[in-house]
């Protein structure tokens, strides 16, 4: 029986050009975490295997940093990074737990300010 629960940062926002930490935490289970996969809607961002370490997909290699812990740091954010992210915990003996994070990337306050107040 799967008793664990995934706690995530939920809905988060960050500024364009900035960075964000995607973090999940598995609790209420003694199951061993063997691997955590980080995914967007239709593509893999990264995998952290407890034994074999990190795999980072080539599309994200330049702007994803492993960690902290089993989390993932996404850097140089663009508006296109807005969307759902999933942490998939592979555990033994429980099986798979999935958490969801929604990230909204906002135009920076400087950009907003510049758009609202134009110099005559």
């Amino acid at each position: 029986m799967m008793t664990g629960t995934i706690e995530t940062t939920g809905n988060i926002s960050a500024e364009k050009g900035g960075s964000i930490i995607l973090q999940c935490h598995l609790s209420s289970t003694t199951a061993q975490v063997t691997q955590v996969n980080w995914e967007q809607q239709d593509q893999l961002l990264a995998i952290c295997n407890a034994d074999l370490g990190w795999h980072i997909s080539p599309s994200f290699k330049d702007r994803v940093a492993p960690g902290p812990g089993l989390g993932l740091t996404l850097q140089s954010l663009t508006v296109n990074d807005t969307g759902e992210y999933f942490c998939i915990y592979h555990t033994y003996p429980d099986g798979t737990y999935t958490g969801r994070i929604f990230l909204e990337v906002l135009e920076s306050s400087v950009a907003e300010h510049g758009a609202r107040f134009q110099i005559p």
Partner: antibody, heavy 119, light 107 residues
Framework: QVQLVQSGAEVKKPGASVKVSCKAS????????IYWVRQAPGQGLEWIGG????????NFNENFKGRVTLTVDTSISTAYMELSRLRSDDTAVYYC????????????WGQGTTVTVSS | DIQMTQSPSSMSASVGDRVTITCKAS??????VAWYQQKPGKAPKLLIY???YRYTGVPSRFSGSGSGTDFTFTISSVQPEDIATYYC?????????FGGGTKLEIK
């Protein structure tokens, strides 16, 4: 350039053990995992397992658990795969491979070591 | 374990033909798929990974696509040197598994 050079062919009796070596050069050994893949005659590829040379951690295909030991000697940049209690269906070419930077895909391969198990 | 079902198991093509090989995973593997080429008596070579990136030095006639459970490997214009067996492989979760292979012959 990256090179993985494996030990020579082996002929073993059923029940015996074999230890295959894989000498790495052309890169920092502890920075990349070493994986092992085998191929029986006329058959496809089968992943045996992998070892993280920086800490010695290993991950195995359950089909081989209890029979395979993956080790490294970082002082000579060499990985080893030992398979015990050999059976005739362990007859295969055994390959060591190395991943890409932060990648699990098998970017570099050794030349292969033929292990024949026969009474 | 995740099964990777590759088809066809063998095929014959003429020089210049477009060739497509498919690989179906028994469960979701996101984009954690690679394709290898193996010539007789030689070690496999990485061609495509993740699953549309060509590895260093791989000719542009080789390409890959897919996500989730369905993946495709294409040779846009087959050359005589492409005679080989091609394998897909998933590294989404251990044990990492390969497809059964597709043997390509030239007519």
């Amino acid at each position: 350039q990256v090179q993985l050079v494996q030990s020579g062919a082996e002929v073993k009796k059923p029940g015996a053990s074999v230890k295959v070596s894989c000498k790495a050069s052309g890169y920092t050994f502890i920075s990349y995992n070493i994986y092992w893949v085998r191929q029986a005659p006329g058959q496809g590829l089968e992943w045996i397992g992998g070892v993280n040379p920086s800490n010695g951690n290993t991950n195995f295909n359950e089909n081989f658990k209890g029979r395979v030991t993956l080790t490294v000697d970082t002082s000579i940049s060499t990985a080893y795969m030992e398979l015990s209690r050999l059976r005739s269906d362990d007859t295969a070419v055994y390959y060591c491979t190395r991943g890409n930077y932060y990648g699990y895909e098998f970017a570099y391969w050794g030349q292969g070591t033929t292990v024949t198990v026969s009474s | 374990d995740i099964q990777m079902t590759q088809s066809p198991s063998s095929m014959s093509a003429s020089v210049g033909d477009r060739v497509t090989i498919t690989c179906k995973a028994s469960q979701h593997v996101s984009t954690a798929v690679a394709w290898y080429q193996q010539k007789p008596g030689k070690a496999p070579k990485l061609l495509i990974y993740s699953p549309s990136y060509r590895y260093t030095g791989v000719p542009s006639r080789f390409s890959g696509s897919g996500s989730g459970t369905d993946f495709t490997f294409t040779i846009s214009s087959v050359q005589p040197e492409d005679i080989a067996t091609y394998y897909c492989q998933q590294h989404y979760s251990t044990p990492w598994t390969f497809g059964g292979g597709t043997k390509l012959e030239i007519k």
